[in-house]
Amino acid sequence: ELENLTVTEVGWDGLRLNWTAADQAYEHFIIQVQEANKVEAARNLTVPGSLRAVDIPGLKAATPYTVSIYGVIQGYRTPVLSAEASTGETPNLGEVVVAEVGWDALKLNWTAPEGAYEYFFIQVQEADTVEAAQNLTVPGGLRSTDLPGLKAATHYTITIRGVTQDFSTTPLSVEVLTEEVPDMGNLTVTEVSWDALRLNWTTPDGTYDQFTIQVQEADQVEEAHNLTVPGSLRSMEIPGLRAGTPYTVTLHGEVRGHSTRPLAVEVVTEDLPQLGDLAVSEVGWDGLRLNWTAADNAYEHFVIQVQEVNKVEAAQNLTLPGSLRAVDIPGLEAATPYRVSIYGVIRGYRTPVLSAEASTAKEPEIGNLNVSDITPESFNLSWMATDGIFETFTIEIIDSNRLLETVEYNISGAERTAHISGLPPSTDFIVYLSGLAPSIRTKTISATATTEALPLLENLTISDINPYGFTVSWMASENAFDSFLVTVVDSGKLLDPQEFTLSGTQRKLELRGLITGIGYEVMVSGFTQGHQTKPLRAEIVTEAEPEVDNLLVSDATPDGFRLSWTADEGVFDNFVLKIRDTKKQSEPLEITLLAPERTRDITGLREATEYEIELYGISKGRRSQTVSAIATTAMG
């Protein structure tokens, strides 16, 4: 079934048809479009059976149309559906305005419906003239355009119309008067020299095609000097002028045949430059340095004359480029006074001569060779020398005994110190120093130096040997060691080694608590920053333990008896006797005796009583083994 035909306007020159129909039923549809008043022949369209809508363009504006449609199914035509609709009114332009006005251009703005026009046709016509109008077209999407290339201070009529394929709107018009040609701004002279000046001027950017500059000597009928420069410039150097001369300079701008009113300025060029401030300083002992002042870019060259004050005949002449303001004059005699003269040349003209006197320095010297910071393998050298003269210094190091190869160093003439290393310790050296300049070798100066000895660890000595220990002592260089390690090992290696760490200032260690009568090995090492010296070694045997022996009882009496004993000579400080009755019926008796004694009479005991006697010696606070005996007092 074909039904629901609707027709809507699509703009002012088209209609849109929509209808409904069963899916996949129709081979095609036939559409007929006819003006309602049947003025023009009907338009027929055949569209595929899959469509349910179609746009019909290219119709007349504001016109009623009758639209019919029928479908074809296997050659069968459905009943016709019809509808009526009108196209829209043709669009009009809105308003046109001149947004910006210059002296040679303007900006045109207008309003118009979106998408209505393919392009706009704009006509620019000078008012009150028969000159041909300027025509231009702009795309239909634009609403603004610049109109360049106009005349200054001129009335224009501008019309615009919108155009489609078969239609053009009613034109809109606007009238406008272009601005006057802009005037130049200020003309100033910013720099004046004796032969040139610099002009600066102001003007709106992008206005002028070019500028014409006229330079005329004031009060002179001579032909003026004309220059034409691009319109982008705002500054110009005018060279080739005469010194101390008044000039009139005029400037006008030109734009598309128009010329501005000229600007003028008067200026006087500077007087011819003079040389000034000639200064002469010594450059070492064989040269002088000249400095002078002069105007920049003024001189073609300078002529310098150098002669010894006392020798008028022998003068040196030099010609130098005009860009220089200083020069070194080498190859002179040391400690000699010189007169130096200079003049400049400007386009053949000579400036007045400037003169000065100066003396060269004394011949360079070296001295005060000094040796410092001596170590076992190195030392530092320092010396004095005339500054800025020497290219190199030569240092020779020779050992006094001539056993080693001579070492030679060549170092920069700027140096005043050197570090000499890689030398053997405890060695005498002679150091020779000489300076070399391009045309001189100084006399040689010398100094002596002796490298320090390596830090020593020596003379391990064992003293105060006794049964229980001994004293270890050694010699070492001052401040050479952080610490010492003393290791004591019994010769039979039966006991654990004993290790003693001592500060680097100590030089002895008293060892006690050793075993009597055995051999020991003692090793002493020094340490510097954790590095160990090879040890000094010594072997020692402790003395045998001193003995008390042969305790004898004699001469018994009712109240006592005599005791005697033997002991090592010179070992014991004293002896201790302990006496007690064997039945322990009385308090024990303890007697301390001085070392030399070997006998003692004991009295005050009970008669006919058995006593137990013990004896031991004391040496340096230690007890010897005890010896015992039994004794009985006589009957009363």
């Epitope: 170590t375 076992p376 393998e377 320090e452 390596l454 830090p455 020593l456 660890l457 260089s477 401040n479 050479a480 952080d482 610490s483 390690l485 760490t501 340490f527 510097t528 920053q529 954790g530 590095h531 160990q532 010296t533 090879k534």
Partner: antibody
Framework: EVQLVESGGGLVQPGGSLRLSCAAS????????MGWVRQAPGKGLEWVSA????????YYADSVKGRFTISRDNSKNTLYLQMNSLRAEDTAVYYC???????????WGQGTLVTVSR | SSELTQDPAVSVALGQTVRITCQGD??????ASWYQQKPGQAPVLVIY???NRPSGIPDRFSGSSSGNTASLTITGAQAEDEADYYC???????????FGGGTKLTVL
């Protein structure tokens, strides 16, 4: 486990200064002497400086004397090297190292690179 | 002098014995210490004192000293022993630590 971690290296212009730090752990810092050793690119080891346990004694190689200062903060277990007036020839990897009283440097950090260049 | 002199390079066949030497006046008084350094790593102490090895150092490394020369001996060199070896000593209070120039050991 003994650990020494250096920091503070970097790029510096000749004449400039840097301060290196070495954070220590895993041993009794206050009982160890400490030191700095450097190694220029492609070159051998060069001892630079050392300091005793409590920081009262310091030692320097001739090449850095008067320019470098070694110090330590036992409360922070940290060793320092203040480097002033740096020269191009001071460019190197700087290692922090420890040594107990009776042996040389027995533990080293992984190093920090100091580059002295314009 | 306190400069310790080492051969720049030494090579050894795998499993063979190699001796690296170090010469200097300071070695008359002090024992040398020896460090192994592999590329991109910090040095490792391998021998110090008369012939002491820190824990973890294989017993194929040993040290000896005679006169002004110290020696590091590797008995049965392994591929992992390929490294730079630096000797190190003291020269007393002014030059407390001195390193040799290093020896590059190649294990073939």
């Amino acid at each position: 486990e003994v650990q020494l971690v250096e920091s503070g290296g970097g790029l510096v212009q000749p004449g400039g200064s840097l301060r290196l730090s070495c954070a220590a752990s895993g041993f009794t810092f206050s009982g160890s002497r400490m030191g700095w050793v450097r190694q220029a690119p492609g070159k051998g080891l060069e001892w630079v400086s050392a300091i005793n346990e409590e920081g009262g004694q310091t030692y320097y190689a001739d090449s850095v004397k008067g320019r470098f200062t070694i110090s330590r903060d036992n409360s922070k277990n940290t060793l320092y090297l203040q480097m002033n007036s740096l020269r191009a020839e001071d460019t190197a990897v700087y290692y922090c190292a420890k040594h107990p009283p009776h042996r040389p440097f027995d533990y080293w950090g992984q190093g920090t690179l100091v580059t002295v260049s314009r | 002098s306190s400069e310790l002199t080492q051969d720049p390079a030494v090579s050894v066949a795998l499993g063979q014995t190699v001796r690296i030497t170090c010469q200097g006046d300071s070695l008359r008084l002090y024992y040398a210490s020896w460090y192994q350094q592999k590329p991109g790593q910090a040095p490792v102490l391998v021998i110090y004192g008369k012939n002491n090895r820190p824990s973890g150092i294989p017993d194929r490394f040993s040290g000896s000293s005679s006169g002004n020369t110290a020696s590091l001996t590797i008995t049965g060199a392994q591929a992992e022993d390929e490294a730079d070896y630096y000797c190190n000593s003291s020269h007393g209070p002014r030059r407390p630590v001195v390193f040799g120039g290093g020896t590059k050991l190649t294990v073939l």
